[in-house]
């Protein structure tokens, strides 16, 4: 799955919440960021995430089987220079400071469920999705025959505004 361009094709700023309307929040603790899944107090502002969208060739089209075979991959950055990354060994999702070009662990294949409902599949471990486990984000293996319908891997995007990138 190779990214076809070094620049994102589009970007947007959005808040991220679970299917059950819990907010995904990010807190700086001991010089590293922690990710929480929590009910937000009424007046508390939702944390924003910059989603950068990249086009990628689907593996089947690289091998000549696919017709056009493009996929959309996203990176998620809640604050400057930090990106959500898959730790496939620990089955965890972590925030790491990175420089571009970003590592493969920072890319997730975008799956639309409806207009604002999405899932994020790990680029480095197909079939494994960002999900919610014990009020934290984790990597969850999903059986494709289940139609990826499990609510714990569904997230809602509430767009705040479009982000102009250069």
């Amino acid at each position: 799955m190779s990214i076809t361009g070094i620049s994102p094709i589009t970007e947007s700023l959005a808040s991220l919440s679970t299917y059950n309307d819990q907010s995904i929040t990010f807190a700086l603790e001991d010089e590293s960021y922690e990710i929480y899944v929590e009910d937000l107090k009424k007046d508390k502002k939702k944390d924003k995430v910059l989603l950068s969208y990249y086009e990628s060739q689907h593996p089947s089209s690289e091998s000549g089987d696919g017709v056009d075979g493009k996929m959309l991959m996203v990176t998620l950055s809640p604050t400057k220079d930090f990106w959500l990354q898959a730790n496939n060994k620990e089955h965890s999702v972590e925030l790491h400071k990175s420089e571009k070009p970003l590592p493969d662990q920072a890319f997730f294949v975008l799956h639309n469920r409806s207009f604002n409902s999405v899932s994020f599949e790990s680029k480095t471990d197909p079939g494994v999705f960002i999900g919610v486990k014990d009020n934290h984000l984790a990597l969850i293996k999903v059986d494709y025959s289940e139609n990826l319908g499990s609510e714990n891997i569904l997230f809602k995007l509430s767009e705040i505004h479009h982000h102009h990138h250069h």
Partner: antibody
């Protein structure tokens, strides 16, 4: 290559319903969202709604929520749109379309069927 | 609903000319715009997506530009086959809306 083959032109009476088909070939049908677009004679385009064949999930333009029903038959790689309570306002060419991306809609229409002309007249 | 307004409504040009048409969104849509060409009696075809990305197989005489609310489609060295209606469309968010179209006639 990708091909979306739509059913033929139909003449229907006001108040009736009709169902048109869109047979997909040349790609993995279940992995791409299918949209439907309306074009009235000499007019612009209107998006009706979309369906994800893998799960049957769908999204609609509010204007068409009570007018159109979208379904798929995975075994034949065919998408269907049924229009109900037809009036002269529904006379148009209807296109099925498909986006450029696996799994993700983005509501971009990269491939189009040849269109189905629906004429509502008594 | 975001309204897409295209101008001019029609234009008549000669083969080899350069032509620019406009599309204005009623709100900021970022770069979430696509352009389509619809030749007489045919289905529309995708030319440009995300404002400036040429779709696979589209000739490089087609160029898209703009961001926010104002967008352009430029055809360098117009060919006879470019006689068509051109539509802009807001993509990415629901509901996607189309402009009223610009008709390009070849003299």
């Amino acid at each position: 290559q990708v091909n979306l083959l739509q059913s033929g032109a139909t003449l229907v009476k006001p108040g009736a319903s009709m169902k048109m088909s869109c047979k997909a070939s040349g790609y993995s049908f279940t992995d791409y969202w299918v949209s439907w677009v309306k074009q009235s004679h000499g007019k612009s385009l209107e998006w009706i709604g979309e369906i994800y064949p893998n799960s049957g999930a769908n999204n609609f333009n509010k204007e068409f929520k009570d007018k159109a029903t979208l379904t798929v038959d995975k075994s034949t790689s065919t998408a269907y749109m049924e229009l109900t309570r037809l009036t002269s306002e529904d006379s148009a060419v209807y296109y099925c379309t498909r986006g450029p991306y696996y799994y993700s809609s983005q509501i971009i229409f990269a491939y189009w069927g040849q269109g189905t002309l629906v004429t509502v007249s008594s | 609903i975001i309204v897409m307004t295209q101008s001019p409504k029609s234009m008549s040009i000669s083969v080899g000319d350069r032509v620019t048409m406009n599309c204005k969104a009623s709100q900021n849509v970022g770069n979430n715009i696509a352009w389509y060409r619809q030749k007489p009696g045919q289905s529309p075809e995708l030319l440009i997506y995300y404002a400036s990305n040429r779709y696979t197989g589209v000739p490089d005489r087609f160029t898209g530009g703009g961001y926010g609310t104002d967008f352009t489609l430029t055809i360098n060295s117009v060919q006879a086959e470019d006689a068509a209606f051109y539509y802009c469309q807001r993509i990415y968010n629901s509901p996607p809306t189309f402009g009223g179209g610009t008709k390009v006639e070849i003299k």
